[in-house]
Structure formats: C-alpha cells, structure tokens
C-alpha cells in the first residue's frame, strides 16, 4: 500500500507501526519466575517506538496484530541442568495482564541446549502486558546479542 | 573501586557450623551473579556455590550441596555462605568472586579470602 | 563434570623469554567459555583471560589466549618479573564450572 506526501511526513507511531527490542535488566527475586527488560539508546541497540515498560515487563499501546520475538542463552548451563539434575527450564511469554486477557502465546524448553529462539503472530491489544517467564534455576546472560525480546506492529 | 572483603573463617569442629560473609562495595551489588571459590592449602581452584543479582536462582558443586547455603542481602550489599556438617576436606581458603555484568560465571574480581579450618 | 588437565605442571623460564601454557578440557567447552587466572602466594588470583581469547581489562597485551573445543593455550610473548606466578585455566560453560590444578611458571 503507497503512503501519501502526508501520511510519510508522520512519525512512526502515529501510523500504527509500533515497535520495540529489549534487552535483559535483571531476574526476578525468589518465587518471581519473570525476566525484568530495559530499552532505550543510552543502552545499545536497544528501543521502544510506541510500547511502553511497566516495571521492566513490555506494555503494549496500540491494538493490532504483532509479530512477539525472544531469545534467551543462559549464562549458567549444563547439559545435565536442562534435562535430568534440575526441573525443566522453560521459557514463556504470555499476555499477564489485564487477567481477563491472560494466556500464554510462546512457550519453550531448553531441553539439551543453551539457547531458544522462537516468534510468532498473535493480536495484541492496547493494556496488554507482556511477560516472560524462566522457570527452572539457570541463569540467562545480560548480553545484548544472546538475549532480547521484542514486538513489532504487523497490521490492525 | 571494586572491593570484596570476606570474614567468618575459622575453626570448626566436624558437624560444625560457619557462616561467611562477603562485604561488597564499588559496584552495584544487586546487578551481578556472586560466588564462592574455594582452594585447600597448596591444592588446586574449587567452585562451590553461585547465586544471581537478584537471589532467586542458586547453584552448588555436588561436594558441597544439601550442607551449604549461599545467600545474599543486597540491602547491606553482602553475600553470605553458610556451612553446615561441615567435614575435614572442607578446610579451605574461601573466596567470594564477582560474575561479569553478562552473568557468565568467570570471575572479574576476588576477595583477599578466609580461611576455614575444620578439625577437631 | 568437565575435567580441565594443564600442563607442564611447572614451567622454568627466563625472564624475556616467551612461555606456553596448555589446558585441555575432557570434552569440549561451550563456546569457548574458558578463562585464565594468574595468582601470586597469598593472594587471590586475577582474571587474565576471558572466553579464551578476550583479555580482561588492565591486562598486558603480553597475555593472550587462543583454542577452541577442547585444547586451550595461555601465551606470555616476554615473560616480566612480575609474571612468575601459577597459572589456572576454568571452564564456565557448563556447570560445575571446574578450574586446572594450575601451571607454575618459575624462574629458571
């Protein structure tokens, strides 16, 4: 679809192309199983055009369909930790709140490996919040090129 | 500066009981993995325990797992080792180690160490 | 467990003179996760080396590292007096993370 001299004169936002890549902040404390993310230049090459963060988890702004991205490599591993001397590590990433609109949208198992990777389409609407789960013991690396999460706006 | 200051070795029955606490400062505690790292007189590096800035995940070596606990308060920007049924070849120097900001677990800075002895 | 062996046990050199450091892993290492220390009596040892080939910050560009899989090796071009020390290598790609019985390098 051709924009208009008018509409390519607009920012981002104002049409609807929401975006943001995230980096990891920090784990939650005991019994808190959800990844704290940051974004923003000052730390790299990482952003938020549109969504917003509530407390380190991902806020969506604008109602549409979105393609939802992450990658976790964790830092503290082992090839026996993934399957049989620790509870299985599994990463999720749900819409957590409002609780009306609660589900999970990704989920993965580390199984014998050190990193996953996945994506998928979904609609998302404005509230929603974003959260990502690592449950298990491991701990996933702060670096930029093994670990982020992102969302991009696809359409309405 | 970065500093690492251990305290808490001493001697110990077999059975016994210590706990060890590493006092931080120079960074921000609470955004980086800690450990433990421990050397028997004249023998060779052991890990023996690591925990996450935040506290909620931690691991041990399987020599020391059901008797230790590692712990940390980042409101006093401490780490803490506690040693419980503490046995002869856990005589060591004892040394706290901070992770790298990516949390991998190799060791940019170290404490001066403390010594536990156990004997009886 | 990965075991790390290092070799020589001791290590007679020179001061100017370039030393070898060998550390083989019994299977190979994630990544290349592995680290190299240096640690003088008494004291706590020092990070030199991070995976295998980054060197850690101060550090001399007389200290480098390279391998991959299972065969690592720590390379002093010109040894200085303040070199002489035992050398540990440590794997942390995969728990327990496990650390050599170290390489002596003394003065010949």
């Known amino acids: 679809q051709r924009l208009s001299r008018a509409q390519q004169q607009l920012p981002l936002e104002s049409l609807g192309w929401d975006i943001a890549e995230l980096q990891l902040n920090h784990t939650g404390p005991q019994q808190d199983p959800r990844l704290y993310w940051q974004g923003g230049p000052a730390l790299g090459r990482s952003f938020l055009r549109g969504p917003e963060l509530d407390k380190g988890q991902l806020r969506i702004r604008r109602d549409g369909i979105y393609m939802v991205h992450i990658q976790v490599t964790l830092a503290i591993c082992s090839s026996t930790s993934t399957s049989r001397h620790h509870h299985p590590t599994t990463l999720a990433v749900g819409i957590c709140s409002p609780a009306s609109r609660s589900i999970s949208l990704l989920r993965l198992s580390f199984h014998q490996g050190c990193t996953i990777a996945s994506q998928r389409l979904t609609p998302l609407a404005r509230g929603d919040t974003l959260c990502t789960n690592l449950t298990g013991t491991l701990l996933p690396s702060r670096n930029t090129d093994e670990t982020f999460f992102g969302v991009q706006w696809v359409r309405p | 500066e970065v500093q690492l200051l251990e305290s808490g070795g001493g001697l110990a029955q077999p059975g016994g009981s210590l706990r060890l606490s590493c006092a931080a400062s120079g960074f921000t505690f609470s955004s980086y993995a800690m450990s433990w790292v421990r050397q028997a007189p004249g023998k060779c590096l052991e890990w023996v325990s690591a925990?996450?800035?935040?506290?909620?995940?931690?691991f041990y070596a399987e020599s020391v797992k059901g008797r230790f606990t590692i712990s940390r308060d980042n409101s006093k920007n401490t780490l803490y080792l506690q040693m419980n049924s503490l046995r002869a070849e856990d005589t060591a120097v004892y040394f706290c180690?901070?992770?790298?900001?990516?949390?991998?677990?190799?060791?940019?800075?170290w404490g001066q160490g403390t010594l536990v002895t156990v004997s009886s | 467990e990965i075991v790390l062996t290092q070799s020589p046990g001791t290590l007679s050199l020179s001061p100017g003179e370039r030393a070898t450091l060998s550390c083989r892993a019994s299977q190979s290492v994630r990544s290349s996760y592995l680290a190299w220390y240096q640690q003088k009596p008494g004291q706590a040892p020092r990070l030199l080396i991070y995976?295998?080939?980054s060197r850690a910050t101060g550090i001399p560009d007389r200290f480098s590292g390279s391998g991959s899989g299972t065969d690592f090796t720590l390379t002093i071009s010109r040894l200085e007096p303040e070199d002489f020390a035992v050398y540990y290598c440590?794997?942390?790609?995969?728990?327990?993370?496990?650390f050599g019985c170290g390489t002596k390098v003394e003065i010949k």
């Open positions: 180690a901070k992770h790298d900001y990516s949390n991998y677990p190799y060791f940019d800075y």
């Open positions: 440590q794997q942390y790609g995969d728990l327990p993370f496990t």
């Open positions: 925990i996450s800035g935040s506290g909620g995940s931690t």
């Open positions: 995976g295998a080939s």
